[in-house]
């Protein structure tokens, strides 16, 4: 065997956040040489399931007819070809909603806010919870907050927004969860419409600060370094300057790459140029273009090795929520606090989209824009204008990871750097 087999792609349809009782299909896509596909679930020593490949042998289907707590968790898949087992896929996090009663979402002082002023979204649960999550509907890239408070149980979490701009306007929902299983979420709250009025326009919303829960004076919002949080205005400018610097650097790099690309292009075919253009810098060979997750090698996207990119699409808000989540939490300190730090980054889209593992029919009927989501996972530039993406950095996810015996190709292989990818779709 010349080298390790490429890792397969793992995804869930209709998404990876599923309401209790609903069906979900997990797909694992490998190569045409695959003879068997295996799905492993974290904490499960035996292979969770195995299936023959479906013709033309490049993928397998694992069906869950009715979502329950037992199915929520972290999955990886492998395939076996004549030369052995593949590398593991990137993890798929299957999340179940409906595990707890829905929280209440409100806006303080009011859901009607003047541009430039401050507003705080308050997510309250009837029973004490330690994790709260906020999503925004009808936004390509919403703010997403996740916070665990020292294991302490809280009845509410605050999501401050300052200064508010027109971009903050829209419909929000929140979820609550217990820290012992981040794969089990409450029912979604009723939607809250945030209406922004006034003429003070800001071209881009400021990153929302770390979530704090109402718990007394010692309960300060955590920053990555443990430093005291800056004032909203100072932090706003710091982030804007940071974004500007990063944008300039990226633009310089892009111009350099384009120049180099143009100079080399005279001696290449169009196909070769496109293949090169889509290859992440430093990569020896292209990642499989099968709609899978690719490692981000962009400095703008890699924030201390752990990313959380969130994207929301809306179809029918009244039907519940589905969220496509892929995440590799660190296993450093199970007692550590999970918090969110939001950063702005501007990944550009690639010119040629990879083949989608989702059927055309699914894309049409569900309006998931799956191609667009996957294209965001690349570094290649496109002619269109860059689009803002909010990255939230999650540190020391409070999940213990139990090692399971890997297939033979895994011996001596160093695990890939953890990455997080989430796509939220409201259903």
């Amino acid at each position: 065997q010349a080298g390790p087999l490429p890792k397969p792609t793992l995804w869930a349809e209709p998404g990876s956040v599923i309401s209790w009782g609903n069906s979900v299909t997990i797909w694992c896509q490998g190569t045409l040489e695959a003879r068997e596909y295996r799905l492993d679930k974290e904490e499960s020593p035996a292979p969770w399931d195995r299936q023959n490949p479906l013709e033309p042998k490049n993928k397998a289907r694992f069906s869950i007819p009715s979502m329950t707590e037992d199915y929520a968790g972290r999955y990886r898949c492998y395939y076996r070809s004549p030369v052995g087992w593949s590398q593991p896929s990137d993890p798929l996090e299957l999340v179940m909603t409906g595990a707890y009663s829905k929280p209440t979402l409100s806006a303080l002082p009011s859901p009607l806010v003047t541009s430039g002023k401050s507003v705080t979204l308050l997510c309250q649960s009837r029973s004490p919870m330690d994790t709260f999550l906020l999503i925004k509907e009808r936004a390509a890239h919403p703010l997403l907050h996740l916070r665990s408070e020292h294991g302490a149980q809280q009845h509410q979490a605050e999501f401050p927004m300052s200064p508010v701009t027109s971009v903050h306007g829209g419909t929000y929902r929140c979820f609550s969860s217990h820290g012992f299983s981040h794969y089990l979420l409450s029912h979604p709250s009723d939607p809250l419409e945030l209406i922004v009025s006034g003429s003070l326009e800001d071209p881009r919303p400021s990153p929302t600060r770390s979530v704090s829960t109402a718990a007394g004076p010692e309960d300060q919002p955590l920053m990555p370094t443990g430093s005291v949080p800056h004032s909203g205005l100072r932090r706003h400018w710091e982030v804007l300057i940071g974004v500007l610097v990063v944008s300039i650097l990226l633009l310089s790099l892009l111009l350099f790459l384009l120049l180099q690309h143009w100079r080399q292009g005279k001696h290449r075919t169009l196909a070769q140029r496109q293949a090169d253009f889509q290859r992440p810098p430093g990569a020896a060979e292209p990642e499989p273009k099968d709609g899978g997750l690719q490692r981000r090698s962009s400095p703008a996207a890699d924030v201390q090795g752990e990313n959380f990119c969130a994207a929301v699409k809306n179809t029918q808000p009244e039907d519940g929520v589905e969220m496509d989540t892929r995440q590799s939490p660190h296993d450093e300190d199970p007692q550590a606090v999970t918090y969110a730090k939001v950063k702005h980054s501007r990944p550009r889209r690639e010119m040629a989209s990879p083949p989608s593992p989702l059927s055309g029919e699914f894309l049409d009927t569900k309006d998931r824009q799956a191609e667009e989501d996957r294209q965001m996972d690349t570094e290649a530039a496109a002619s269109e204008a860059p689009q803002d993406v909010t990255y939230a950095q999650l540190h020391s996810f409070t999940l213990r990871q139990k090692a399971t015996e890997p297939p033979p190709s895994q011996e001596g292989a160093s695990p890939a750097e953890p990455s997080v990818y989430a796509t939220l779709a409201i259903h």
Epitope: R35, E36, K41, S44, P45, A46, P47, W48, D49, R50, Q51, N52, D70, P82, V83, G84, W85, E405, P406, P407, P408, S409, Q410, E411
Partner: antibody
Framework: QVQLQESGAELVKPGASVKLSCKAS????????MHWVKQRPGQGLEWIGE????????NYNEKFKTKATLTVDKSSSTAYMQLSSLTSEDSAVYYC?????????????????WGQGTSVTVSS | DIVMTQSPSSLSASLGDRVTISCRAS??????LNWYQQKPDGTVKLLIY???RLHSGVPSRFSGSGSGTDYSLTISNLEQEDIATYFC?????????FGGGTKLEIK
């Protein structure tokens, strides 16, 4: 040591159903899949299906999809196979067998331990 | 399904003999071949997995070889306790399938 204790011989009438059991001991029941294999008198072995005791996931041989139903009871570390609408073709010895990874970090899987077999005779 | 053809269906040999049993698959099974021994009382044991790997507790006189579609089991020094029926089984694709068996007797 690993042991798979199967239930006793069964004499059943055509059209009836029978439920065979296989009690596992000497290992962690949920760490290994359980397979079921059929052997007709003087003939070879036929794979019926498999079940993952930890989550109840099953895979069946197409030939036995409507014939056999595999279940487990984790609390008693017991696997079950129900055979329905029995005919004389179902008269056979049925084995349960443990399937799992062999060798440390090798990634090779096989049925490594078998029960003693349960004889099922279908006769009116 | 992959068809496994075993030969011979039966054979007689003397104690101390070297015995070889063959197994052919209807398609390439990439070395995912196991050998089982079934004693006259019905007890079944795994002997060899993945073509040539000896299962724990199996005497070293048993060995396996092969690749692609052709595989074999060899008993280098036949002993009385080896009297049994031997089955090959492919584990390359679901469903697993078995050969028809080779019944080994003492002359």
């Amino acid at each position: 040591q690993v042991q798979l204790q199967e239930s006793g011989a069964e004499l059943v009438k055509p059209g009836a159903s029978v439920k065979l059991s296989c009690k596992a001991s000497g290992y962690t029941f949920t760490n290994y899949w359980m397979h079921w294999v059929k052997q007709r008198p003087g003939q070879g072995l036929e794979w019926i299906g498999e079940i993952n005791p930890s989550n109840g996931r099953t895979n069946y041989n197409e030939k036995f999809k409507t014939k056999a139903t595999l279940t487990v009871d984790k609390s008693s570390s017991t696997a079950y196979m129900q055979l329905s609408s029995l005919t004389s073709e179902d008269s056979a010895v049925y084995y349960c067998a443990r399937w799992g990874q062999l060798g440390l970090r090798e990634g090779y899987y096989a049925v490594d331990y078998w029960g003693q077999g349960t004889s099922v005779t279908v006769s009116s | 399904d992959i068809v496994m053809t075993q030969s011979p269906s039966s054979l007689s040999a003397s104690l101390g003999d070297r015995v070889t049993i063959s197994c052919r698959a209807s398609q390439d099974i990439s070395n995912y071949l196991n050998w089982y021994q079934q004693k006259p009382d019905g007890t079944v044991k795994l002997l060899i997995y993945y073509t040539s790997r000896l299962h724990s507790g199996v005497p070293s006189r048993f060995s396996g070889s092969g690749s692609g579609t052709d595989y074999s089991l060899t008993i280098s020094n036949l002993e009385q306790e080896d009297i049994a029926t031997y089955f090959c089984q492919q584990g390359n694709t679901l469903p697993p399938t078995f050969g028809g068996g080779t019944k080994l007797e003492i002359k």
